[in-house]
């Protein structure tokens, strides 16, 4: 007990009344007003509770404190008086804060700040919406994926920030009068092939497809190694080059060098280069036959095989390349005497004559083209004087009936053996490769070396044998007339031709040798 008469056991937040009693401090309450035992407690009174008589007024909040309370302006409001806290409604000076004015960047990009009582909202620009997880942030609305399908089916929707476009799909274009972009855009397929908007390589032909196009190898061409056909990036090579390779089993550096040149030309070939490529091939052939190098060391039969292979391949390559030439007449000649004459025309109804130094060819234009082939008609003649180097002692195989006739009118083949090649070897070709049976014959007039008197002159062609070699033959070719240095031949097919002098001894005047010129 306190001598001054005050209880020393009063609980927390209370004060003594006398030596035996205590009372809770203001803002606290106990079960009874006067506390007489130390077991009782003083608890904080929540002045802000709903039944409380405290009223802070509008735009404010009541904050309970230990033993007391404070009135404060609600968020988004501030006191005009400047006092942060107050005790009752009469002291309340709270008014709305304009956050939009205080902080213009409150709504970040693409939104507009709108002040509200005690707060603000962000209003998004057209094409934007509030982000659910951050209601103050406007994000782009993807109209293309929102299920609105705002574009016509011929277009594709292109979302961009705050907007979208209806663009023609690749390979399509706006229909006449339609815009390209707005939501009323309507498109139609572009024919890239006829409009020239394609990227097809010149070795291919453009084919239009819905909304796109593809590039296919030209007829007679194949895709380059590893590149598929029918793609936009398809690149093709002329098959004629790929098949013209050295004959198997022939070992010659000179020939290998020639075919290396041919393959290089094939690799670099584009139809626009047809003229140059033809010239380069003939230049290479001219050089090969001017200087056959180690071909001279090959056995005779192999030399004939090489000649056969060169003649066959040259004809195919020239036929293929000449289809890409423009209309007109071409003449090329080379140092060693190789000569090419070519005429390219759209179908014409007349005969064509190709003239060269040592040979003239005459035939009907309508032989040149296969029916149904839309390309130009080509007639070509190549004179290859040097080919005779490889055809020395090449055999002549006569049809049995011609053999018999010769034995009747001549004493027989002299012991000297192989016939002599009098003329250049010439090769004739058409765009039409089906030339085994011409509807009207072709006529050749050869200039050649002098004929030894009393020797038989024959018009012959080179027949490519099954073994890849060949021989001279007369089937389908007849000698129309001959004199000392010229002979006229008529044939019902095309190939490589020449005039031979066979070692027959003519016994009496031979009607076949009579001049018909």
């Amino acid at each position: 007990q306190d001598s001054r008469g005050c209880a020393r056991w009063c609980p927390q937040d209370s004060s003594c009344v006398n030596a035996t009693a205590c009372r809770c401090n203001p803002g606290f309450s106990s079960f009874s007003e006067i506390i007489t035992t130390p077991m009782e407690t003083c608890d904080d009174i929540n002045e802000c509770a709903t039944l409380s008589k405290v009223s802070c007024g509008k735009f404010s909040d009541c904050w309970n404190t230990e033993g007391s309370y404070d009135c404060v302006c609600s968020p988004g409001y501030e006191p005009v008086s400047g006092a942060k806290t107050f005790k009752n409604e009469s002291e309340n000076t709270c008014q709305d804060v304009d956050e939009c004015q205080q902080n213009p960047r409150l709504c970040k990009s693409y939104g507009t700040c709108v002040n509200t009582l005690g707060s603000y909202t962000c209003q998004c620009l057209p094409g934007f919406k509030l982000k659910p997880e951050d209601p103050k942030l406007c994000t782009d609305v993807n109209e293309c994926t929102s299920g609105q399908n705002p574009c016509h089916s011929s277009t594709h929707c292109l979302n961009n920030v705050g907007s979208y476009q209806c663009r023609c799909r690749p390979g399509w274009q706006p229909i006449p009068g339609s815009p390209n972009g707005p939501n009323n855009t309507v498109c139609e397929d572009v024919d890239e092939c006829s409009s020239g908007q394609h990227q097809c390589d010149s070795s291919t032909v453009c084919f239009n497809t819905v909304g796109s196009y593809s590039c296919r190898c030209r007829p007679g061409w194949k895709p380059r190694h590893g590149i598929p056909n029918n793609q936009k990036d398809t690149v093709c090579e002329d098959m004629t080059f790929s098949t013209w390779t050295p004959p198997p089993g022939v070992h010659s550096q000179t020939l290998s060098r020639f075919f290396d040149k041919v393959q290089d030309l094939g690799r670099d070939y584009k139809p626009g280069l047809a003229n140059n490529t033809i010239q380069s091939i003939l230049q290479a052939l001219d050089e090969l036959l001017e200087a056959p190098g180690d071909l001279e060391t090959l056995p005779r039969l192999q030399q004939h095989c090489v000649a056969s292979h060169l003649l066959d391949g040259l004809e195919d390559v020239l036929r293929g390349l000449s289809k890409n030439l423009s209309n007109g007449l071409l003449n090329f000649s080379y140092p060693a005497g190789t000569e090419l004459s070519l005429e390219v025309q759209k179908q014409v109804d007349r005969s064509v004559t190709l003239r060269q130094n040592q040979a003239v060819m005459q035939l009907d234009w309508n032989q040149a083209q296969k029916s149904g082939d839309p390309g130009p008609s080509v007639v070509g003649l190549v004179s290859i004087p040097g080919m005779g180097k490889l055809l020395a002692e090449a055999p002549l195989v006569l049809e049995p009936e011609k053999q018999m006739l010769l034995h009747e009118t001549h004493q027989g083949l002299l012991q000297d053996g192989s016939p002599i090649l009098l003329s250049d070897v010439i090769s004739a070709f058409l765009s039409n490769n089906d030339t085994q049976n011409l509807s009207s014959p072709v006529t050749f007039t050869f200039s050649h070396r002098s004929v030894i008197p009393r020797q038989k002159v024959l018009c012959v062609f080179w027949e490519h044998g099954q073994n890849g070699c060949g021989h001279w033959a007369t089937t389908g070719c007849s000698t129309i007339g001959t004199r000392d240095t010229s002979t006229i031949c008529r044939c019902t097919h095309l190939s490589s031709f020449a005039v031979l002098m066979a070692h027959y001894d003519v016994q009496e005047e031979d009607p076949v040798l009579t001049v018909i010129t």
């Epitope: 001279e296 060391t297 000649s333 004087p385 002692e393 070396r449």
Partner: antibody, heavy 118, light 107 residues
Amino acid sequence: QVQLQQSDAELVKPGASVKISCKVSGFSFTDHTIHWMRQRPEQGLEWIGYIYPTDGNTRYNEKFKGKASLTADKSSTTAYMQLSSLTSEDSAVYFCAKRGYYWYFDVWGTGTTVTVSS
Amino acid sequence: DIQMTQASSYLSVSLGGRVTITCKASDHINNWLAWYQQKPGNAPRLLISHATNLETGFPSRFSGSGSGKDYTLSITSLQTEDVATYYCQQYWNIPYTFGGGTKLEIE
């Protein structure tokens, strides 16, 4: 008629160069190759090379590469041969010739004597 | 290179006699051979092409023959105007090569 007229004889010093000409007439200059031959005193003939006037295409005997250079002027129908770094070994008569239909020489020039002497 | 060998550098034959000049190639030249006649102080003149073809302007007493590697120029009934040097030339391969020449004299 077909003629190949060559330039006159030349006397040149060792190490010098000489250019001899061959004027063609009587045939189409661009249709045939023009060949050059050398004939040293009391010796045989050697083929030097040719020029094809149509496109200026040339071909040389390996032995004469670097020694002879062939050119042609279509407007004057003249073929030329320049010989460089001359030594006494190059003293010879030089002939130009027209190639026949095959690779023999059917018409020859008059010949130009080149003498290399100090 | 193909070597052309003319066995005789000189041949002395009596007037009206028969002459045979030979030419041998180091490889087959398949008749791609020419013969030339060169008179002193003149350019060579094409005499025979393709081993057997006599050029116009030469009399028929000149003839050529042969095959493979071996070739022959024959002159029957030799005349004084035939005194000259005769050369063979192969045109099968580049470089074109000539024989060393055969000088014909009258004994």
